[in-house]
């Protein structure tokens, strides 16, 4: 049963390692994959002394942990590399961190990617 499914056809693309990987640095990535598989967008980033450094953004193929997510939100408590995924075109354009183990009300840290 798949309810309220949001099709993902393209995602914001960014690669901090673009020169080594021989890719574009930034752009829009069309998401390809088997017709029976769902497509998602993702973002990975680091927090270096309070400064957000985006690692990668792009398409992320069929992952049940991304199903039914319209927003890209990381909830792991203090991960080394932050990761979030979502469904919907360009849904990784903005991403947030809500630490899940906080006792107090967590604050959102929305980030609008600005390539360096």
């Amino acid at each position: 049963a798949i309810l309220g499914r949001s099709e993902t056809q393209e995602c914001l693309f960014f690669n901090a390692n673009w020169e080594k990987d021989r890719t574009n640095q930034t752009g829009v990535e069309p998401c390809y994959g088997d017709k029976d598989k769902r497509r998602h967008c993702f973002a990975t980033w680091k927090n270096i002394s309070g400064s957000i450094e985006i690692v990668k953004q792009g398409c992320w193929l069929d992952d049940i942990n991304c199903y039914d997510r319209t927003d890209c939100v990381e909830k792991k408590d203090s991960p080394e590399v932050y990761f979030c995924c979502c469904e919907g075109n360009m849904c990784n354009e903005k991403f947030s961190y809500f630490p899940e183990m906080e006792v107090t009300q967590p604050t959102s840290n929305p980030v609008t990617p600005k390539p360096p």
């Epitope: 942990n65 039914d68 792991k76 899940e100």
Partner: antibody, heavy 119, light 107 residues
């Protein structure tokens, strides 16, 4: 610390029903897809069913489709498996497992609960 | 459904040995392959995901490689606590399927 605690297993006659529960703690349950995996005595692992973070998407192995129903109550941090029309071949230890974020893998498991289907 | 075939089904080794377990998928699964360790009476434990990424807290003597249809789990120097059964699992598409397991026993 992530903890998954299954309950509800036991002895049931063929054709009978059981409802398994999995109580989750130590993490934000509503942020993770969950699954049930079973292991027949002396055999390997078999994925049974999975459910997305909201419960809007559910998946089943062909061997249990139409007989088992997976569900979750995010307000109670609990995963369920309703098992109907049980057969002898459903006899197994049933594990509750969490889908890791960004891993596409079962990164945390419960200790399991034994379901025995026998007359 | 994607079939996962592990070999060998069992092996005997000594502490300090280098151990290699292989897993073959019936079709290409890219790098969507996970490895688990299970000890008798215990739940499985994730060792490696996405073919080669070590799960947090897993000793570096464990490593994974491969893509497409052929994958390998290597234990560089077998320790007493490594005697267990190891399973591969594809996460490319549902139904997610496991290999039959490889039991690593003491020689």
């Amino acid at each position: 610390e992530v903890q998954l605690l299954e309950s509800g297993g036991g002895l049931v006659q063929p054709g009978g029903s059981l409802r398994l529960s999995c109580a989750a703690s130590g993490f934000t349950f509503s942020n993770y897809a969950m699954a049930w995996v079973r292991q027949a005595p002396g055999k390997g692992l078999e994925w049974v069913s999975a459910i997305s973070v909201t419960g809007g998407s559910t998946y089943y192995a062909d061997s249990v489709k139409g007989r088992f129903t997976i569900s979750r109550d995010n307000s109670k941090n609990t995963l369920y498996l309703q098992m109907n029309s049980l057969r002898a071949e459903d006899t197994a230890v049933y594990y509750c497992a969490r889908h890791g974020s960004g891993t596409r893998a079962f990164d945390s498991w419960g200790q399991g609960t034994l379901v025995t289907v026998s007359s | 459904d994607i079939q996962m075939t592990q070999s060998p089904s069992s092996l005997s080794a000594s502490v300090g040995d280098r151990v290699t377990i292989t897993c073959r998928a019936s079709q290409s699964i890219s790098r969507h392959l996970n490895w688990y360790q299970q000890k008798p009476g215990k739940a499985p434990k994730l060792l490696i995901y996405e073919a080669s990424t070590l799960q947090t807290g897993v000793p570096s003597r464990f490593s994974g490689s491969g893509s497409g249809t052929d994958f390998t789990l290597t234990i560089s120097s077998l320790q007493p606590e490594d005697f267990a059964t190891y399973y591969c699992q594809q996460s490319y598409s549902t139904p997610w399927t496991f290999g039959g397991g490889t039991k690593v026993e003491i020689k």
